[in-house]
């Protein structure tokens, strides 16, 4: 999950090389899966430089790249926007909190370090994948019906994967396990457009069916880094247009924040969907 | 795992038009741009082109405008590319491949997975 | 468009030697570049992304480095599967363009 003011977003840090995402939609789920490592800080394998190279294993935050200053001394400077590529097409277009298009998230990260230590930085967040557009207002009732269809709809997406995994590369053996006891069970219901009174009464009905999608999103979702929380950036994926409702994707987890911390912990986003307390297994996030 | 299978060798002749495949399997067809190359004979590669079948939207390089036409079919995951007005010089082996990239954090961009390659000859 | 200058065009080289594999951009790009390796008559490979990542499953052997402009491949202690053609290519912006090509022999 992309950095996080509390923990790295706000501070200077030297972390892990940061594992890349893409926004996979499976279904119509963007899961994020990893494609490789970015590190635009000078890494080098020839073991003559790396002694020579004090950048070497001194990784900056995203919108930041290692620079040495004039004691040799690594530090994290912020990345100039020209450093980024151009985009090479509207998919990697990214839209911020406030409604500006970015040209990739390299832009947007790299502006975001500029205002570090603002106001208007601390506030900022990367939004959702692509160029900004027109959403409507989350009204109250399709508030109501958020946690409803998207635990239904998470639930499809993992049946989904199941049925197309033939290679072994979308879910590990055992999530599959997990997934083929749902997918078997006859009181599923099927995938369509029901009304909300038949999806509360089939999560009633079927609680324990709704408990491994509801853990394995969060796990999906939970990349940059890997801590058990969800930023605002992290959610990004849920913002994308496949998604049932995504208009009221930021409202929903705003709500969910108990702590308003601004990040959404794995308790905090089990019980948003409905899952109690007792069922709540960081195990299940694989 | 991933896989990009490509249509068989062509044989045409100059002024015709060929259509080649690159059918995609082991992932989300939608996921990901797939892009063209062409190799001639003891010679480098030359970019052609990508299509991204999520929204059929395309990028040229300005060497094979109106030389190539890219399209995709989400149904069978199969990306087309179309060579038009055939002489001589088209005749090469022809790639497709995935980009895989990053978007979330930063950009990454690079062809993880390359197809089998289709070889066009054009000749009288 | 950038431009992409690779050298040499040919090598000849024994197992167990190690060679480097030069690219030149036209334009600083920023470590966007890759290296493939091809077999004659197969589709090339990936090894090297972000000019300086190893791809899943390519031999240690294998190092990439370089910034800016100028970028190369390393192999140290060659094998005799290591012998075929190399390419760098550019992703900083459209159209993505490829070297030249090194034509790495069994002296």
């Known amino acids: 999950a992309p950095q996080q003011e509390a923990l790295p977003d706000e501070t200077e840090v030297v972390e892990e090389t940061v594992a890349e995402v893409t926004e996979v939609s499976v279904g119509a789920n963007p899961v994020q899966v990893e494609v490789g490592e970015f590190d635009d800080g000078a890494e080098e394998t020839e073991e003559e430089v790396v002694a020579e190279n004090p950048c070497q294993n001194h990784h900056c935050k995203h919108g930041k790249v290692c620079e040495l200053d004039e004691n040799n001394t690594p530090m994290c400077v912020c990345q100039d926007p020209t450093s980024c590529p151009a985009p090479i097409g509207e998919f990697e277009k990214v839209c911020s909190n406030d409604n500006k298009t970015f040209d990739s998230s390299c832009h947007f990260f790299a502006t975001k370090c500029t205002l570090e230590g603002t106001k208007k930085g601390h506030k900022l967040h990367l939004d959702y994948i692509g160029p900004c557009k027109y959403i409507p207002p989350c009204l109250d009732s399709e508030l109501t019906e958020f946690p409803l269809r998207m635990r239904d709809w998470l639930k499809n997406v993992l049946v989904t994967l199941y049925e197309r995994d033939e290679d072994n590369n979308l879910l590990t053996e055992k999530q599959k396990l997990r997934v083929k006891k749902i997918h078997e069970n006859e009181k599923r219901l099927e995938a369509g457009d029901h009304p909300v009174e038949l999806l509360a009464r089939d999560f009633e009905k079927n609680y324990n069916m709704y408990i491994f999608p509801v853990h394995w999103q969060f796990g999906q979702l939970d990349q940059h880094p890997i801590d058990g929380y969800l930023s605002h950036t992290e959610l990004a994926p849920l913002r994308a247009p496949l998604i049932p409702m995504e208009h009221c994707t930021t409202r929903f987890f705003e709500t969910c924040d108990l702590d308003n911390d601004k990040y959404i912990a794995l308790d905090e986003w089990a019980g948003c969907f409905g899952i109690k307390q007792k069922d709540i297994d960081k195990d299940l996030v694989i | 795992q991933v896989q990009l299978q490509q249509s068989d060798a062509e044989l045409v002749k100059p002024g015709a038009s060929v259509k080649i495949s690159c059918k995609v399997s082991g992932y989300t067809f939608t996921d990901h741009t797939i892009h063209w190359m062409k190799q001639r004979p003891e010679q480098g590669l030359e970019w052609i082109g990508y299509i991204y079948p999520r929204d059929g939207s395309t990028k040229y390089n300005e060497k094979f405008k109106g030389k190539a036409t890219l399209t995709a079919d989400k149904s069978s995951s199969t990306t087309y590319m179309q060579l038009n007005s055939l002489t001589s010089e088209d005749s090469a082996v022809y790639f497709c491949?995935?980009?895989?990239?990053?978007?979330?954090?930063?950009?990454?961009?690079?062809?993880?997975?390359w197809g089998t390659g289709t070889t066009v000859t054009v000749s009288s | 468009d950038i431009q992409m200058t690779q050298s040499p065009a040919s090598l000849s080289a024994s197992v167990g030697e190690t060679v480097t594999i030069t690219c030149r951009a036209s334009g600083n790009i920023h470590n966007y570049l890759a290296w493939y390796q091809q077999k004659q008559g197969k589709s090339p490979q990936l090894l090297v992304y972000n000019a300086k990542t190893l791809a899943d499953g390519v031999p240690s052997r294998f190092s990439g480095s370089g910034s800016g402009t100028q970028y190369s491949l390393k192999i140290n202690s060659l094998q005799p599967e290591d012998f075929g053609s190399y390419y760098c290519q550019h992703f900083w912006s459209t159209p993505f363009t490829f070297g030249s090509g090194t034509k790495l022999e069994i002296k």
């Open positions: 491949a995935r980009l895989a990239f990053g978007i979330i954090t930063t950009v990454v961009r690079y062809f993880d997975v």
